[in-house]
């Protein structure tokens, strides 16, 4: 921000009324009036260029310092070219000297040179040559100097002429203030600029109404430089919840809008499925039946639990069931839908039912499923199973009702046994099998059916209560088709896959495990 100038003395604005002191009296400096741009202007002028040893002083009136620490002196002046005078005026100069003196009282007409301290020699950038003078082109020079720190009640300025042809058209003395400033929603008071060029006065800012320093943020501070400019902003204020930045102020959110935290962001419109908010709202309440999960941002619409899975099928495959379903028709407005599968088994004889989570195996964990299918295995034969698939989302936990669909399935067969070739010779094959333990109690015997490959007219059957059998009297180097089936009280279980096993050729005789 630009520095604010507080004027202590302005000769040009005074219209020749200041009555400055000249020394020696009646010689040297002279107050004169001229016409410029059809306006009368006053100037202090001296032009004793033909006489040597000039020492003409012009002293201002006493200037009250007030709160100023460093003053700035702006001079507007014109200097005639020494060569514009006949013979070059050998004693002519083109500079003058600027002095100041501090005092606690006005000395009036008592002028003492020794009290004055030189500020600088003032030289023009442009001199007025004959043609400019003739054409009344005033070559105006502007020079600025500063003095500080000042400590007394007031001061004088003085101008010493040593033989120049010079006119002072403007003498303006001012000090600088950093103006009152609103920045980053912080108010900084008007501050007097310091006197030492390298130093910067640190000024604390105050947050405007309804603004605060953000958590973990720095308090607002600015630095008032010697030239009255604010520099190096540190920290900031932000509008509190329910308020947004409008120009340099925090304004309450309009009805139907909200802001839930201290931030730079504007108020947001209340999202879908919320009630209209009052002015200055920090949040928007959900409509009845709609909810907000704890992790949901306030800007997200309110949502509700999903409806039940749309379509559920249970396809039995022996002692396995594949459950398939489609997503709910109403997601509740959320994308975080997960499914939970629960299982209940019922004994047909007694009609008694109970949970079966511990006795069945799922192809993936049955809670928090994101896919829409799962396979359940290790089911017991001749048992009724009911599967429940529940759809849940982030707000399901906020209501007591549940959204689910059920499917029932009866297991009539055991699972097909898993068959392995344990060993073979030229005339025998040793075969073993397994079925899930829960089903083993239901099995009475296992039936092994085998025949030569390509011979569809005859086959052999062996029954056993164990889990293995050796098939003898087989032809060497011959492929046999083997299938194992469980036999239960209720009938036959599912048959295994038909396996092809080959006996050894006579050259590679001897028992060999595979």
């Amino acid at each position: 921000a630009q520095g604010k100038e507080v004027v202590l003395l302005d000769f040009a604005a005074a219209g020749g009324e200041l009555g400055w002191l000249t020394h020696p009296y009646g010689k040297g400096w002279d107050l004169m009036q001229n016409i410029m741009n059809d306006m009368p202007i006053y100037m202090y002028s001296v032009c004793n260029v033909m006489s040597g040893d000039q020492d003409n002083w012009l002293r201002t009136n006493w200037v009250y310092r007030g709160e100023a620490e460093r003053i700035f002196i702006e001079l507007k002046f014109t200097v005639r070219d020494c060569n514009s005078f006949p013979g070059g005026a050998s004693s002519c100069k083109e500079t003058f000297n600027l002095y100041y003196a501090e005092s606690d009282l006005d000395y009036g007409t008592n002028f003492q040179k020794r009290l004055f301290t030189k500020i600088d020699t003032i030289a023009p950038d442009e001199i007025t040559v004959s043609s400019d003078f003739e054409a009344r082109h005033v070559k105006l020079n502007v020079e600025e100097r500063s003095v500080g720190p000042l400590t007394r009640k007031g001061f004088y300025l003085a101008f010493q002429d040593i033989g120049a042809c010079v006119a002072l058209l403007s003498v303006r003395v001012y000090y600088k203030k950093c103006p009152e400033l609103l920045q980053s929603l912080a108010r900084f008071p008007e501050t007097i600029a310091g006197s030492d060029a390298p130093s910067l006065a640190t000024v604390a800012g105050t947050c405007v109404d309804h603004a605060v320093v953000p958590p973990g943020g720095e308090e607002p501070r600015m630095h008032c430089a010697v030239d009255g400019e604010w520099l190096v902003p540190i920290g900031q204020c932000l509008c509190q919840a329910g308020y947004e930045k409008v120009e340099d102020a925090c304004q309450a959110c309009s009805p139907g809008f909200f802001k839930f935290e201290v931030s730079e962001s504007p108020c947001l419109e209340c999202p879908e499925h919320t009630l209209p908010s009052p002015e200055g709202a920090t949040s928007c309440e959900c409509e009845e039946g709609f909810f907000r999960a704890p992790q949901d941002p306030m800007s997200m619409p309110c949502t509700r639990p999903p409806s039940a899975p749309h379509y559920l099928t249970a396809v039995g495959m022996g002692a396995k069931v594949e459950l398939r379903w489609t997503p709910p028709q109403d997601s509740g407005g959320r994308e975080d839908i997960v499914y939970s599968v629960t299982c209940e088994q019922c004994w047909p004889e007694s009609g008694e039912c109970g949970p079966c989570e511990s006795s069945v195996r799922y192809s993936e964990p049955p809670h928090g499923l994101t896919r829409t299918s799962v396979t359940v295995s290790d089911l017991e034969p001749h048992m009724n199973y009911t599967f429940t698939v529940e759809a849940r989302n982030g707000v399901s936990g906020l209501v007591t009702s549940r959204s689910f669909r059920t499917a029932s399935v009866s297991i009539n067969q055991t699972e097909p046994p898993k068959v392995r070739l344990e060993g073979r010779s030229t005339t025998s094959l040793s075969v073993s099998w397994s079925i899930p333990p829960p089903q083993q109690s239901r099995v009475w015997k296992y039936e092994v059916t085998y025949r030569k490959k390509g011979d569809s007219n005859s086959y052999n059957v062996r029954r056993t209560e164990g889990f293995s059998v050796t098939l003898d009297d087989l032809a060497p180097d011959t492929t046999y088709l083997v299938q194992v089936q469980a036999l239960t009280q209720e009938g036959q279980g599912a048959g295994s896959k038909v396996h092809e096993f080959q006996t050894l050729s006579p050259e590679g005789s001897g028992s060999l495990a595979v």
Epitope: Q33, I35, V79, S84, F85, R136
Partner: antibody, heavy 128, light 107 residues
Framework: EVQLLESGGGLVQPGGSLRLSCAAS????????MAWVRQAPGKGLEWVSR????????HYADSVKGRFTISRDNSKNTLYLQMNSLRAEDTAVYYC?????????????????????WGQGTLVTVSS | DIQMTQSPSTLSASVGDRVTITCRAS??????LAWYQQKPGKAPKLLIY???NLHTGVPSRFSGSGSGTEFTLTISSLQPDDFATYYC?????????FGQGTKVEIK
Amino acid sequence: EVQLLESGGGLVQPGGSLRLSCAASGFTFSHYMMAWVRQAPGKGLEWVSRIGPSGGPTHYADSVKGRFTISRDNSKNTLYLQMNSLRAEDTAVYYCAGYDSGYDYVAVAGPAEYFQHWGQGTLVTVSS
Amino acid sequence: DIQMTQSPSTLSASVGDRVTITCRASQSISTWLAWYQQKPGKAPKLLIYKASNLHTGVPSRFSGSGSGTEFTLTISSLQPDDFATYYCQQYNSYSRTFGQGTKVEIK
């Protein structure tokens, strides 16, 4: 030494014309503002016209505006005053006068000029 | 136009006298005033410019003062060569008007 010598004066009838000349010597003519000042018999001085060092700007007294024309030829070091539509009240001694800013020891030029050097004058009589 | 009024119109004085002639402007002319001396049948001569500045070669018995509307020409000790008519002239405006003149004659 600065010398200004007027010529061209004489008797002329009302409504007639006359051209005055002023020959300059002893100074750099092209540096000077030049002017004509007249003095009616037994009366005071009256400024008539002025011309800048390079030929402009020109100014005229209200009493002669539109009738008199001032000009100069710096190559000939000569100032002229062309007088048309002469009237009886134009009867006067006409002086040519010069001003050199170099001899004006002020920092800022005055709004107009004064006259540092004068010729001896030439008499113009307008009469029927 | 700015009117310049001189007083007195005629002044009788003796050699060695201190003589003061006054010139009044109808409006402020700051210090833009010149004084001339004219002897019968001769051209005027510049004495003072900018109210108080002595022109080159003019004797120091001549001095000028004043500003605004009131100006004076002073001859500190009248000499025989000083009997003449004196004119003031303002050059604060382009009209460059003269006063009507003050004749200084031998008493």
